[in-house]
């Protein structure tokens, strides 16, 4: 019936052409370059928080949109005027022609134009909505920017105050360090003064010692003189006694000279009828040399020679080789009988060794070795033990086979360290081994976690320092 065509002319304006019979109607409509067509998809700018668009750019875009709006409005007005003008012209033509069918065409054209106008209006409404959306988005972005800016400003203020605090603290510490340096210098000076004073004191003491040594020499000389006098007196007394006994013998021949009895060990003392605990004088085997020892005449049948006792920490056991050789301490209290005597004694016949132990909780235990002897001094009084029984552990806390004896001045252990110096006291150290009954004496509540205490590992562990210990020997055939 009719042909309606839409095309673009060479200058980019939209061209509407209506063909009806022999008549052709062409309408040229102005096209706005800045107006986005409804068919093209709208792509919004994805805005992320804290990554704002430039404020000036947003303002510029708003201005562009306002211009577009204004242009569109003008264009609508022009369109309306254009349509009205055309309508007037068409009406005059219609009236002049007075042709019925042309009226219908004009009505149709009018309808088309109205439809187009409606479509344009709808497009404009869309554009307006888009502009509003964009404006809202921009406002939100601006709000976000301002919030972000406030947040940053707050953070900067916080950091600034923190920096100020740190600076204050730093200056305070600097002052403190300077004060400490001053104090340190003063202390160093006082230490130096003390050192000088001590050196003076030491030199004074040295001179006093020298004087004392001279006095000792003099005293020794005097002592020798006194000893000679005493010897002479004794000889005189003996002569007198001899004379008296001779004269008495002449008068009473029944009086015999009293025999001097000597005992090798406490077993012999016991067998001679002395069954009371106490200190007795013993004689070295094959010698006239004497030694005082404590004899236990009650425990386990009696006859025990006590060779070591610890009970109260009253005696220092960090002694020299010579002191351990000859013995030290008090036989009625803490003491060491002496390695030389024990070595000579235990090499004469078979001896048993009993070690009696007490802890701080009231418990007692013992280790009994059915064979015991000490080697000679040439072999560093090496201990030899066999046949372990008792309640203080099924494994011997004195390393087997026995080790050499070590003291602070005689290092014979199997350690690159010096066990005697490290653990204190003389003992048959291994490297350094599971026992040391001659270690430091620690009182109750200070006796745990002590590596250098009185130790018997296979009864109480490595860090426990015992309350009391007794080492005693007796012939195996007693």
């Amino acid at each position: 019936y009719n042909n309606f065509r839409k095309s673009m002319d060479s200058i980019g304006k939209k061209q509407y052409q209506v063909q009806h019979g022999s008549c052709s109607y062409t309408f040229l409509l102005p096209e706005m370059d800045n107006c986005r067509s409804s068919s093209s998809p709208y792509v919004s700018n994805a805005v992320q928080r804290d990554a704002p668009l430039e404020y000036d750019d947003s303002v510029q875009r708003l201005q562009v949109l306002e211009n577009i709006m204004e242009n569109n409005t003008q264009w609508l007005m022009k369109l309306e005027n254009y349509i009205q003008d055309n309508m007037k012209k068409e009406m005059v033509e219609i009236q002049q022609n007075a042709v019925q069918n042309q009226t219908a065409v004009m009505i149709e054209i009018g309808t088309n134009l109205l439809n187009q106008t409606a479509e344009q209006t709808r497009k404009l409404t869309d554009v307006e909505a888009q502009v509003l959306n964009q404006t809202t988005r921009l406002e939100l972005q601006l709000l976000e920017h301002s919030l972000s800016t406030n947040k940053l400003e707050k953070q900067i203020l916080d950091q600034t105050s923190e920096i100020n605090k740190l600076q204050d603290k730093n200056s305070f510490l600097e002052k403190k360090v300077l004060a400490m340096e001053d104090k340190h210098i003063i202390q160093l000076q006082s230490i130096k003064e003390e050192k000088d004073q001590l050196q003076v004191l030491v030199s004074k003491q040295n001179s006093i010692i020298e004087e004392l040594e001279k006095k000792i020499v003099t005293a020794t000389v005097n002592n020798s003189v006194l000893q000679k006098q005493q010897h002479d007196l004794m000889e005189t007394v003996n002569n007198l006694l001899t004379m008296m006994s001779t004269s008495n013998s002449a008068k009473d021949p029944t009086v015999a000279k009293e025999e001097q009895i000597s005992f090798r060990d406490c077993a012999e003392v016991f067998k001679s009828g002395h069954t009371t605990n106490g200190i007795y004088t013993l004689t070295f085997p094959n010698s006239t040399e004497e030694i005082k020892a404590y004899c236990d005449m009650e425990a386990g049948g009696g006859g025990w020679t006590i060779i070591q006792r610890r009970e109260d920490g009253s005696v220092d056991f960090q002694r020299t080789w010579k002191e351990y050789k000859v013995g030290f301490g008090n036989p009625s209290g803490e003491y060491w009988l002496g390695n030389e005597f024990v070595s000579q004694l235990t090499n004469q016949q078979r001896y048993v060794l009993k070690i009696h132990l007490k802890d701080w909780e009231g418990n007692e235990a013992y280790s009994l070795y059915e064979h015991f002897y000490l080697s000679s001094e040439e072999l560093n009084y090496r201990i030899h033990l066999k046949g372990l029984t008792g309640t203080a552990g099924k494994i011997s806390s004195i390393s087997q086979p026995g080790n050499d004896f070590s003291t602070k001045d005689g290092d014979n252990d199997k350690c690159i360290c010096k066990c005697s110096q490290m653990l204190t006291g003389g003992w048959w150290f291994d490297a350094c081994g599971p026992s040391n009954l001659n270690g430091m004496y620690y009182p109750q509540r200070q006796n745990t976690n002590k590596f250098n205490g009185i130790k018997w590992y296979y009864w109480k562990g490595s860090g426990y320092s015992l309350k009391a210990t007794t080492m005693m020997i007796r012939p195996a055939d007693f």
Partner: antibody, heavy 112, light 107 residues
Framework: VQLQESGPGLVKPSQSLSLTCTVT???????YAWNWIRQFPGNKLEWM?????????SYNPSLKSRISITRDTSKNQFFLQLNSVTPEDTATYYC??????HYVSSMDYWGQ | SIVMTQTPKLLLVSAGDRVTITCKAS??????VAWYQQKPGQSPKLLIY???NRYTGVPDRFTGSGYGTDFTFAISTVQAEDLAIYFC?????????FGGGTKLEIK
Amino acid sequence: VQLQESGPGLVKPSQSLSLTCTVTGYSITSDYAWNWIRQFPGNKLEWMGYISYSGSTSYNPSLKSRISITRDTSKNQFFLQLNSVTPEDTATYYCARSTFGHYVSSMDYWGQ
Amino acid sequence: SIVMTQTPKLLLVSAGDRVTITCKASQSASNDVAWYQQKPGQSPKLLIYYASNRYTGVPDRFTGSGYGTDFTFAISTVQAEDLAIYFCQQDYSSPPTFGGGTKLEIK
């Protein structure tokens, strides 16, 4: 420490077996006990006796009547004499040092 | 005298195996028990003394334990060179006595 046995390989029944053990690297008078042990065919081991560093001796009761262990300290040697031997005494004879001087003990050094 | 009963008499093992030998004393021997190794044509060598003490230079694959009458000797990982006869010995009372021996053979 080294120990070396020496003596005749064959002894006629009823005669005496005499063996020597020469010790090098340690003085037999210093410490320890110096033993004689024998091993019968079938690998059974028997301790015979020792002489201690001090010169005291100890013997296996099963041999007591016919065994004697002596020493020569100047040569650092000790000796075994077993009298009235029989074919039952056929064995490998070892000398050895024990770790205890006055009593029987484990033996840490053996002859060849 | 104390009789030492050693078991087993023979052990057939492969290299890498763990082996255990036991010795039972007829009366208490305290901890005075030693273990020896005798390789073919050689004299016995001390491995363990006082029941559990490893002798100088003895590899730690050899271990001993026990007290009183029951004693155990073990080789954790048998090696070819461990082919030998192993003896236990008590020296708690005189005369010292030996076990009958355990022959260790490698498959």
